[in-house]
């Protein structure tokens, strides 16, 4: 059977440019190694935002220079994207891959529309 991935339809980033959402997958197999990727879809272009591989029961580790952080609990991943600006508003897709043991499984969510509003600059005080 194919793997199903669920994620929220819409998330509003905080005034500090931080957006968090949960990505949940229904695992058809007993995976010990899982890869989670956040993709951004703009028009028909899909680009990778960040990716992390983790062993089941261990923490999710993104690269040091990644704009993403995350935690995992069972078949659920809590993802946080930082440093977002208004121009980053768009559809963010959660992709889950069961890497080991074989067989490999792919699961792709429908995407979370993240809205980012740049904060108004503070007015100069007299």
């Amino acid at each position: 059977k194919a793997m199903h991935v669920a994620q929220p339809a819409v998330v509003l980033a905080s005034s500090r440019g931080i957006a968090s959402f949960v990505c949940e997958y229904a695992s058809p197999g007993k995976a010990t190694e899982v890869r989670v990727t956040v993709l951004r879809q703009a028009d028909s272009q899909v680009t990778e935002v960040c990716a992390a591989t983790y062993m089941m029961g261990n923490e999710l580790t993104f690269l040091d220079d990644s704009i993403c952080t995350g935690t995992s609990s069972g078949n659920q991943v809590n993802l946080t994207i930082q440093g977002l600006r208004a121009m980053d508003t768009g559809l963010y897709i959660c992709k889950v891959e069961l890497m080991y043991p074989p067989p490999y499984y792919l699961g792709i969510g429908n995407g979370t529309q993240i809205y980012v509003i740049d904060p108004e600059p503070c007015p100069d005080s007299d």
Partner: antibody, heavy 105, light 102 residues
């Protein structure tokens, strides 16, 4: 038959280590047959039953190169072998031009 | 995949079918291959057109039954078409449908 051969596939124009890469083959006048895949850092691999134990897929991310080591070759391994990149959403979006491998007695 | 061969004239509509033995959700792609060339991605996710693919090509279906439709055949569309599931390994291809000129 019984001989060995190593195929290589050099990639450019994209971040090689961010993509899985497949080998797909096509026997003369026949359809496409999936052979093997290798993922990202090269630790995770998968093979078709028809080549398991005889073929080994590997990659060198520092050289942006994919390999297929083919041992104990049989006449039925005669085919054009294609390397193909996995797109972010899963399908095979870019294919090599193919290499013809002929196994004859 | 069915039919094995489809004989049609330019301007006609082509309907190609692909059936999976078990559900592959929407993890299905269609490829076009011309003689002496590598396959080219047409459709992914069952219904999304790949970059640069004309809108006369469309895909539909989910689960086990999928369709590739070419609304009006152009001379360059006469080729072999393959479906492939990519939701799990092994990544199987269909046997192909040849669209040739009647």
């Amino acid at each position: 038959p019984g001989r060995s051969l190593r195929l290589s596939c050099a990639a450019s124009g994209f971040t090689f280590s961010s993509h899985g890469i497949h080998w797909v083959r096509q026997a003369p006048g026949k359809g496409l047959e999936w052979v093997a895949v290798i993922w990202y850092d090269g630790r995770n691999k998968d093979y078709a039953d028809s080549v398991k134990g005889r073929f080994t897929i590997s990659r060198d991310n520092s050289k942006n190169t994919l390999y297929l080591q083919m041992n104990s070759l049989r006449a039925e391994d005669t085919a054009v072998y294609y390397c193909a990149r996995v797109a972010p959403l899963g399908p095979l979006d870019y294919w090599g031009q193919g290499t013809l491998v002929t196994v004859s007695s | 995949q069915s039919p094995g061969t489809l004989s049609l004239s330019p301007g006609e509509r082509a309907t190609l079918s692909c059936r999976a033995s078990q559900s592959v959700s929407s993890y299905l792609a269609w490829y076009q291959q011309k003689p002496g060339q590598a396959p080219r991605l047409l459709i992914y996710g069952a219904s999304s057109r790949a970059t640069g693919i004309p809108d006369r090509f469309s895909g539909s279906g989910s689960g086990t039954d999928f369709t590739l439709t070419i609304s009006r055949l152009e001379p360059e569309d006469f080729a072999v078409y393959y479906c492939q599931q990519y939701g799990r390994s092994p990544f199987t291809f269909g046997p192909g449908t040849k669209v040739d000129i009647k």
